[in-house]
Interface confidence: low
C-alpha cells in the first residue's frame, strides 16, 4: 500500500516519500525507487530558510540606499538579509521595506524617547518648570534656570517654550 502521508522532513511524490532538501539547499531532482533526493546549495546572494522542495532559491533582500536602507545583517544561504534605516530615519513596517524621517518635537515639547531604527521619536509636553525652544529629534525639555542659586530674582516667568529671565535683586539703599 503506497503511503498517503510522510514523516517530518519528507514529502510525498509519485506515491513515495522523498527527503526534503535542508535549509540552504534547493531541489534538483526528486528521489526515485533507487535514488535519493538530489539537492544543491543555494548560490551567492540566495537563500532558503526551511526544509523544502523548492527548485529555486530566494534572492536576498536588497537594502536599497535610494529608499534610505542599509544592511543590518548580511544574509547567508539559510537566512535573508536584514535591512535597517540610515541614521535619522526609521522603518515604516516590520519588513523594513522603506524608511521615513524621524519626527522632530516642536517647541514646547521634548524628546521622551529618541527614535530607533524601527520606532519614531516619542515627544512629550514640557511640564511646568521645564521648557524647549527648539524643534528637535534629540533635545529633552530643559529645566528653567534657577535664579535663586545665582542670587538673582525672576524678572520674567518661564513657559513651556521659554526659559525664565533672571535679573538683579532690588537693593535698599
Amino acid at each position: 500500500e503506497p503511503p498517503t502521508a510522510c514523516r517530518e522532513k519528507q514529502y510525498l511524490i509519485n506515491s513515495q516519500c522523498c527527503s526534503l532538501c535542508q535549509p540552504g539547499q534547493k531541489l534538483v531532482s526528486d528521489c526515485t525507487e533507487f535514488t535519493e533526493t538530489e539537492c544543491l546549495p543555494c548560490g551567492e546572494s540566495e537563500f532558503l530558510d526551511t526544509w523544502n522542495r523548492e527548485t529555486h532559491c530566494h534572492q536576498h533582500k536588497y537594502c536599497d540606499p535610494n529608499l534610505g536602507l542599509r544592511v543590518q545583517q548580511k544574509g547567508t544561504s539559510e537566512t535573508d538579509t536584514i535591512c535597517t534605516c540610515e541614521e535619522g530615519w526609521h522603518c515604516t513596517s516590520e519588513a523594513c521595506e522603506s524608511c521615513v524621517l524621524h519626527r522632530s518635537c516642536s517647541p514646547g515639547f521634548g524628546v521622551k524617547q529618541i527614535a530607533t531604527g524601527v520606532s519614531d521619536t516619542i515627544c512629550e509636553p514640557c511640564p511646568v518648570g521645564f521648557f524647549s525652544n527648539v524643534s528637535s529629534a534629540f533635545e529633552k525639555c530643559h529645566p528653567w534656570t534657577s535664579c535663586e542659586t545665582k542670587d538673582l530674582v525672576v524678572q520674567q516667568a518661564g513657559t513651556n517654550k521659554t526659559d525664565v529671565v533672571c535679573g538683579p535683586q532690588d537693593r535698599l539703599r
Epitope: N66, E87, G88, T92, S93, A95, E97, V100
Partner: antibody, heavy 119, light 112 residues
C-alpha cells in the same frame, strides 16, 4: 507596475458623508504611506493627510482634522478617505498618492475622484 | 504652515526655448541630514499631477533630462532647457519637511 485606482465620481447632499477608495497594486501596500490631496475646481493642490497602512498611523493637516478620516484595509490593499458634514466648498477632485519613501515625495497618483456637494 | 510662493503665475513659452519657474519657501527646507525636501510636480491638462523632481535636484524615473531642479534653503528653480509641446500644464513646487506638507500656487506653462 504601480497603480492606484480610485472609486468613481460622487454627488452628495450638504451634511452627508462620502467615502472614497483607492486600490493599490504593483507594490507592497503596507510598505508605503498613502496620502490624500484635494484640488478644488480651478484651484491648486492641498495636502490633507496620510496613513501608514501597516500600523494604521495617520497624520492630518490641521485644516482637515475632524472632517477627514483616513483608513486602510491591508487585506485588499485599499486606502479610504471619508469626508463628513459635507459643504458646498468640499466640492473638489480628491487624489490618493503614494509617498515614495526616501524620495519623500508623492511618486504615484490615482486618477482622482470628483466629489460634488450640491442640494 | 510653510508657505510656498511661485512665480510667475503664467508662463507663455516658445517650443525649443528655455523656461524657468521660481519657488520660494517661508522657511528653510534643508533637513539636518543635508537633504532639501523640495519637489516639483506637473499637472497636464485633464490629468493627475505627476512627480518630476524630488529632493531639489533628482529627476524621477522617466523624466526627460531637459528638466532640472536647483536652489538652496528657501529659493528654488525649475528649468526646462528646451520646452516641448508636451510640457504644457501647471507646475507645482512642494515641501515635505514639515507637516502639513504644502504646495505652491502653481505656474501655468502654455505655448505662445
Amino acid at each position: 507596475q504601480v497603480q492606484l485606482v480610485q472609486s468613481g465620481a460622487e454627488v452628495k447632499k450638504p451634511g452627508s458623508s462620502v467615502k472614497v477608495s483607492c486600490k493599490a497594486s504593483g507594490y507592497t501596500f503596507t510598505g508605503y504611506n498613502m496620502n490624500w490631496v484635494r484640488q478644488a475646481p480651478g484651484q491648486g493642490l492641498e495636502w490633507m493627510g496620510n496613513i501608514d497602512p501597516y500600523y494604521g498611523n495617520t497624520n492630518y493637516n490641521q485644516k482637515f482634522k475632524g472632517k477627514t478620516t483616513l483608513t486602510a484595509d491591508k487585506s485588499t490593499s485599499t486606502a479610504y478617505m471619508e469626508l463628513s458634514s459635507l459643504r458646498s466648498d468640499d466640492t473638489a477632485v480628491y487624489y490618493c498618492a503614494r509617498l515614495g519613501l526616501q524620495l519623500y515625495a508623492l511618486d504615484y497618483w490615482g486618477q482622482g475622484t470628483l466629489v460634488t456637494v450640491s442640494s | 504652515d510653510i508657505v510656498m510662493t511661485q512665480t510667475p503665475l503664467s508662463l507663455p513659452v516658445t517650443p525649443g526655448e528655455p523656461a524657468s519657474i521660481s519657488c520660494r519657501s517661508s522657511q528653510s527646507l534643508v533637513h539636518s541630514n543635508a537633504n532639501t525636501y523640495l519637489h516639483w510636480y506637473l499637472q497636464k491638462p485633464g490629468q493627475s499631477p505627476q512627480l518630476l523632481i524630488y529632493k531639489l535636484t533628482n529627476r524621477f524615473f522617466g523624466v526627460p533630462d531637459r528638466f532640472s531642479g536647483s536652489g538652496s534653503g528657501t529659493d528654488f528653480t525649475l528649468k526646462i532647457s528646451r520646452v516641448e509641446a508636451e510640457d504644457v500644464g501647471v507646475y507645482y513646487c512642494s515641501q515635505s519637511i514639515h507637516v502639513p506638507w504644502t504646495f505652491g500656487g502653481g505656474t501655468k506653462v502654455e505655448i505662445k
